[in-house]
């Protein structure tokens, strides 16, 4: 089938990095500068993506693959193929329509992106608060109050903080 197709369609012989040039009797011509073809048999080459402004070049365009962009410091990628750059905030903040705002009391964000999430409620697990939460850190839950009675021989290690919610990344 491949052999039959190549006899019928000379363009199928053109490899990636070239295009089938109708203006030159369908011979395979190299992609012009700033363009690429990632598959064989293409009749045109695609224009390379330009990483402009807040976008910086992670991988240069070649004749067979598009450029790849990421974001300049202070911003992070969103979307497929880093189609957007979103502003970072500081830990203890979240991005709102009015910019970066501090987490409300009782919530925290330990990353430069995402939303503020509620502190873990230790009492739901029958635990006590070992370390108070801050805007940047969740509370650390310790042993239950009963375990802290006088004469207890050892303190059990703090249970890992439960994930109270998941921030959309």
């Amino acid at each position: 089938f491949e052999r039959t197709r190549s006899l019928q369609d000379p363009c199928s012989n053109c490899p990636a990095g070239t295009f089938c040039d109708n203006n030159r009797n369908q011979i395979c011509s190299p992609c012009p500068p700033n363009s690429f073809s990632s598959a064989g048999g293409q009749r045109t080459c695609d224009i390379c993506r330009q990483c402009k402004g807040v976008f910086r070049t992670r991988k240069e365009c070649s004749s067979t693959s598009n450029a790849e962009c990421d974001c300049t410091p202070g911003f992070h990628c969103l979307g497929a193929g880093c189609s957007m750059c979103e502003q970072d905030c500081k830990q203890g903040q979240e991005l709102t329509k009015k910019g970066c705002k501090d987490c409300c009391f009782g919530t925290f964000n330990d990353q430069k992106r995402g939303i503020c999430r509620p502190w873990t409620n230790c009492s739901l697990d029958g635990k006590s608060v070992l370390v108070n939460g801050t805007k940047e850190r969740d509370v650390v839950c310790g042993p239950s109050p009963a375990d802290l009675s006088p004469g207890a021989s050892s303190v059990t290690p703090p249970a890992p903080a439960r994930e109270p919610g998941h921030s959309p990344q």
């Epitope: 189609s83 957007m84 910019g99």
Partner: nanobody, 121 residues
Framework: QVQLQESGGGLVEPGGSLRLSCAAS????????IGWFRQAPGKEREGVLC????????YYADSVKGRFTISRDNAKNTVYLQMTNLKPEDTAVYLC??????????????WGPGTQVTVSS
């Protein structure tokens, strides 16, 4: 045809001032934010300041707070970056971009070519 064009750059002594302009054409200026970025030789590009379509400002760089301010004149389709108490480390190519929102830039946003600012005695 969409265009952004920066102007107002030049050579200035430390402690001096400059006002950069970003003039826009070919799109509905009032609907867009305008963000200023800069790139110093051998350094990463960094965000400086942005003004939203409604006129609110967002500082991207703490180092310019108290020294740089941003304003817009929608009648002239122009945004101004007023820079005072300039320091040698402010030397860079300054360029403006036009996102819909100061907090989020898209790969198809418009950008100007930039204007050179040199702070030196």
């Amino acid at each position: 045809q969409v265009q952004l064009q920066e102007s107002g750059g030049g050579l200035v002594e430390p402690g001096g001032s400059l006002r950069l302009s970003c003039a826009a054409s070919g799109f509905t200026f009032d609907d867009y934010a305008i963000g200023w970025f800069r790139q110093a030789p051998g350094k990463e590009r960094e965000g400086v300041l942005c003004i939203s379509s409604s006129g609110g400002s967002t500082y991207y760089a703490d180092s310019v707070k108290g020294r740089f301010t941003i304003s817009r004149d929608n009648a002239k389709n122009t945004v101004y970056l007023q820079m005072t108490n300039l320091k040698p480390e402010d030397t860079a190519v300054y360029l403006c971009g036009a996102p819909r929102d100061c907090s989020r830039y898209s790969s198809d946003d418009y950008w100007g070519p930039g204007t050179q600012v040199t702070v030196s005695s």
